[in-house]
Amino acid sequence: ESLGTEQRVVGRAAEVPGPEPGQQEQLVFGSGDAVELSCPPPGGGPMGPTVWVKDGTGLVPSERVLVGPQRLQVLNASHEDSGAYSCRQRLTQRVLCHFSVRVTDAPSSGDDEDGEDEAEDTGVDTGAPYWTRPERMDKKLLAVPAANTVRFRCPAAGNPTPSISWLKNGREFRGEHRIGGIKLRHQQWSLVMESVVPSDRGNYTCVVENKFGSIRQTYTLDVLERSPHRPILQAGLPANQTAVLGSDVEFHCKVYSDAQPHIQWLKHVEVNGSKVGPDGTPYVTVLKTAGANTTDKELEVLSLHNVTFEDAGEYTCLAGNSIGFSHHSAWLVVLPAEEELVEADEAGSVYAG
């Protein structure tokens, strides 16, 4: 006998996630073809600086990989070029377009991408794995107080449905590798570790694969033991920025602190031609500090709108608690509007114009 009953739980309105990025496009190319991906600006407006990403890693231009703000070309494509491609806004990392690309061994014949002449699980509906919500996969560092629970997720899709496996520090990770075990939910693409301890620190990688390709994501877990310390600032933040005159800029600062942190954004200034005072303390002006209605989340971002040449310079995120202070700095370079910026680095290519 099966019995059923119902109870209700009432929740308040919560933040609604931002709009879904454009529909995932699945594209099939033949070996040796030129892969061309186009990402026009939404609503026809200005594009702003963009970056092209494959399987979570920024694409670096080369003789074979041609990167533009609205277009990506991969010449003489091979099987290794299969994967999930996305075009993102450089500053916000918002996904503007994303594509699942599969490169088949046979050159494409142009018309018959309906797959009638291919094996039964190939064609437009088949393809290498891709992240279903790539914009949610940007955060990679998780700092958690000991004794709490951690969940890593890598939701993905592909055809055939990909499998998922997990590595810790590059090695296969199984339940017997930790006291308390782990909980895997393959249908939720998740790994759960209850009551984490310092020995759980490390790099956790999900590997999602099917016969057409493989994608992976690595998360870093830090388990915080509760000895009081000054705030910890995430490495690499805020990051140096280069912006075009009149554009908008965001600096980010991620603060970890047991005791309630106090966060300030400072801009370094000159007084009578000097950057530091008689005692060696830098001259600064406070741009943003905690107010009655300011949340820590809001304080972790400094937004500069319609930047001018006067906005160029050094910016500092300063975080303090009852134990002490920590600070990280970054530089803003402002370029003239007519100058086209072409910057290639490990994070990919940036265009502004």
């Epitope: 929740g11 919560a14 998780l142 958690v144 951690v150 759960v192 005791a259």
Partner: antibody, heavy 127, light 98 residues
């Protein structure tokens, strides 16, 4: 063994005050939170509020905001619920519960779970 | 309320008034006792809880299933969402002996 023991309940007149204590043992008090949940006689569970002892951050239900205060003494591994301006509708068994977070980079919320509960202490507000 | 006999399969449902993702826990409470955690994150069995208990659902509709009712399972069961603050409980479902 994880244990939570509430004390301080009793009979109080409307408008009066009472302070409940929750003594914790068997776990790292400063790594997790403490929630207070109450249950009126014959009724369901109602969340009152919670504290994270390491940074003192607190949250409260609307029904008690401004009247109840949660605090913690980490040196004593004890959390407190200070109840002022008590009303008849505050009559209930009050439970404290260890509360841990489920940290997940993929979502924009932290889920909080109450895994160990005390035995409860009865507060009666009556004239 | 629901009533059943030993060995029965019991399903208790919980509906949220808005999307709460999978941030739902289930608790069991016996008369005069404190609640006990059974399930968290909609479907994860808490350590030490018998495997006859299972949870499922996401969004607004959630289910707690007892695959084979045992005498010690007669109790009141509460769902609770923690997607938003304040967390809220369902009104409870009492499982009684038929």
């Amino acid at each position: 063994e994880v244990q939570l023991v509430e004390s301080g309940g009793g009979l109080v007149q409307p408008g009066g005050s009472l302070r409940l204590s929750c003594a914790a043992s068997g776990f790292t008090f400063t790594s997790t939170g403490i929630s207070w949940v109450r249950q009126a006689p014959g009724k369901g569970l109602e969340w009152v509020g919670r504290i994270y002892p390491t940074n003192g951050s607190t949250n409260y239900a609307d029904s008690v905001k401004g009247r109840f205060t949660i605090s913690a003494d980490t040196s004593k591994n004890t959390a407190y619920l200070q109840m002022n301006s008590l009303r008849a509708e505050d009559t209930a068994v009050y439970y404290c519960a260890r509360t841990y977070g489920i940290y997940d980079l993929y979502v924009d919320y932290t889920e909080y779970v109450m895994d160990y509960w005390g035995q409860g202490t009865l507060v009666t507000v009556s004239s | 309320e629901a009533s059943g006999g030993s060995g029965d399969r019991v399903t208790i449902t919980c509906r949220a008034s808005q999307d709460v993702s999978t941030a739902v826990a289930w608790y069991q409470q016996k008369p005069g006792k404190a609640p006990k955690l059974l399930i968290y994150s909609a479907s994860f069995l808490y350590s030490g809880v018998p495997s006859r208990f299972s949870g499922s659902g996401s969004g607004t509709d959630f289910t707690l299933t007892i695959s084979s009712l045992q005498p010690e399972d007669f109790a009141t069961y509460y769902c609770q969402q923690s997607y938003t603050t304040p967390p809220t409980f369902g009104q409870g479902t009492k499982v009684e002996i038929k």
